[in-house]
Interface confidence: medium
């Protein structure tokens, strides 16, 4: 059962999960002036049995440079905060990892692979929180949360964590040295399908006269 | 002249910036089957129907939470109903909208 | 480009009848296949996604199987209401394609 929304944003903190349960997704995304291969996977899917968990399909990224219908943008504001925010964190490994059942490792990255990593949770998925560089966590419980089924419906459980503007960093369980982390969201963000019951789509249609006609794709 | 066919799709009861889905375009002529033509991240990336490419343009309005389709040089073989929907990429498209009937004659 | 082989094209039922549809895919496509569901003049309803996971607010008479290139949409007790045209599709690569449609009606 996908989680219906994001992990609970906690200020001047990231999240992190470990582990990824089965039925985790992640999309294939390519860095801009590169494109997934043509036929190439929309994402990878974390699979397996009760022994062996891994992540089936294989994202590949080739360049769009070739395309004369390409055209460079420069990202509004927002894409910009948004890139900034989600730079690619070397892979945090705890060392018993492997070992959890149902649970896919980080996927190794890909050439050419976007900055920003967006997983598709799954009910029983846990996160870890914490404090980005320059900032110190208070705990009055734990710095994580789960994914859970209540009544039919996906909540994530709230963090017990403060962050503090002192120069210190704290850590993510199984870390040996502390990880500097860029505000805002990691690359593990992810926006699950929010619920369907209140959401709409209207369309308009307006047919124009063009003399002149060009395509541009954002790639 | 050519004709240049223009579409937009009002998102409601969500925003069309967050991410963890794209928003498509799809098109049925009368009496036939379905038949994707493109969607957009809520970043701007695009993929396209290679039958289509050469004339689709998806584009996203994130202050006016809506995205759009510009289909240009228009036949009667682009008579058909299309539909915008939220695509949840392996979860299926779950949120569609009504549909719009374009009829396109010589 | 993936094609996906729906049959039959058409079908006749009665109410109360179990009712299966398949769909084939030119390759091996894991569980990335989505079931839907449509009626005169309206949007297509999303039934079943990954190939077996029943979407939110759809009857339980309604189930999806199968992986890799075979997958199956199985109407059990079919109901009034359930003479529609069905469409699988798959969203394992781009371009995404879907079935030709499976239209249902009453015996």
């Known amino acids: 059962e996908l989680c219906d929304d994001d992990p609970p944003e906690i200020p001047h903190a990231t999240f992190k999960a470990m582990a990824y349960k089965e039925g985790t997704m992640l999309n294939c995304e390519c860095k801009r002036g590169f494109r997934r291969i043509k036929s190439g996977s929309l994402y990878m899917l974390c699979t397996g049995n009760s022994s062996h968990s891994s992540w089936d399909n294989q994202c590949q990224c080739t360049s769009s440079a070739t395309r004369n219908t390409t055209k460079q943008v420069t990202p509004q504001p927002e894409e910009q905060k948004e890139r900034k925010t989600t730079e690619m964190q070397s892979p945090m490994q705890p060392v018993d990892q492997a070992s959890l059942p149902g649970h896919c490792r980080e996927p190794p990255p890909w050439e050419n692979e976007a900055t920003e990593r967006i997983y598709h949770f799954v009910v029983g998925q846990m996160v870890y929180y914490q404090c980005v560089q320059g900032y110190r966590a208070l705990h009055r419980g734990p710095a994580e949360s789960v994914c859970k089924m209540t009544h039919g419906k996906t909540r994530w459980t709230q963090p017990q964590l403060i962050c503090t503007g002192e120069m210190e960093t704290s850590q993510f369980p199984g870390e040996e040295k502390p990880q500097a982390s860029p505000e805002g969201r990691p690359e593990s963000e992810t926006s699950c399908l929010v619920t369907t019951t209140d959401f709409q789509i209207q369309t308009e249609m307006a047919a124009t006269m063009e003399t002149s006609i060009f395509t541009t794709e954002y790639q | 002249p050519s004709q240049t066919l223009s579409l937009t799709c009002a998102v409601s009861g969500g925003s069309i910036s967050s991410g963890g889905y794209s928003w498509s375009w799809i098109r049925q002529p009368p009496g036939k089957g379905l038949e994707w033509i493109g969607y957009?991240?809520?970043?701007?990336?695009?993929y396209y129907n290679p039958s289509l490419k050469s004339r689709v343009t998806i584009s996203v309005d994130r202050s006016k939470n809506q995205f759009s389709l510009k289909l240009s040089s228009v036949t009667a073989a682009d008579t058909a109903v299309y539909y915008c929907?939220?695509?949840?990429?392996?979860?299926?498209?779950?949120?569609w909208g009504q549909g719009t009937t374009v009829t396109v004659s010589s | 480009d993936i094609v996906m082989t729906q049959t039959p094209s058409s079908l006749s039922a009665s109410v109360g009848d179990r009712v299966a549809i398949t769909c084939q895919a030119s390759?091996?496509?894991?569980?990335?296949v989505n079931w839907y569901q449509q009626k005169p003049g309206e949007a297509p309803r999303l039934l079943i996604y990954?190939?077996?996971t029943l979407q939110r607010g759809v009857p339980s008479r309604f189930s999806g199987s199968g992986s890799g290139t075979g997958f199956t949409l199985t109407i059990n007790s079919l109901q009034p209401e359930d003479f529609a045209t069905y469409f699988c599709?798959?969203?394992?690569?781009?371009?995404?394609?879907f079935g030709g449609g499976t239209r249902v009606d009453i015996k």
């Open positions: 599709q798959q969203s394992h690569s781009t371009p995404i394609t």
């Open positions: 957009i991240y809520h970043s701007g990336s695009t």
């Open positions: 990954g190939a077996s």
């Open positions: 929907a939220r695509a949840g990429y392996y979860y299926g498209m779950d949120v």
């Open positions: 390759r091996n496509i894991w569980s990335y």
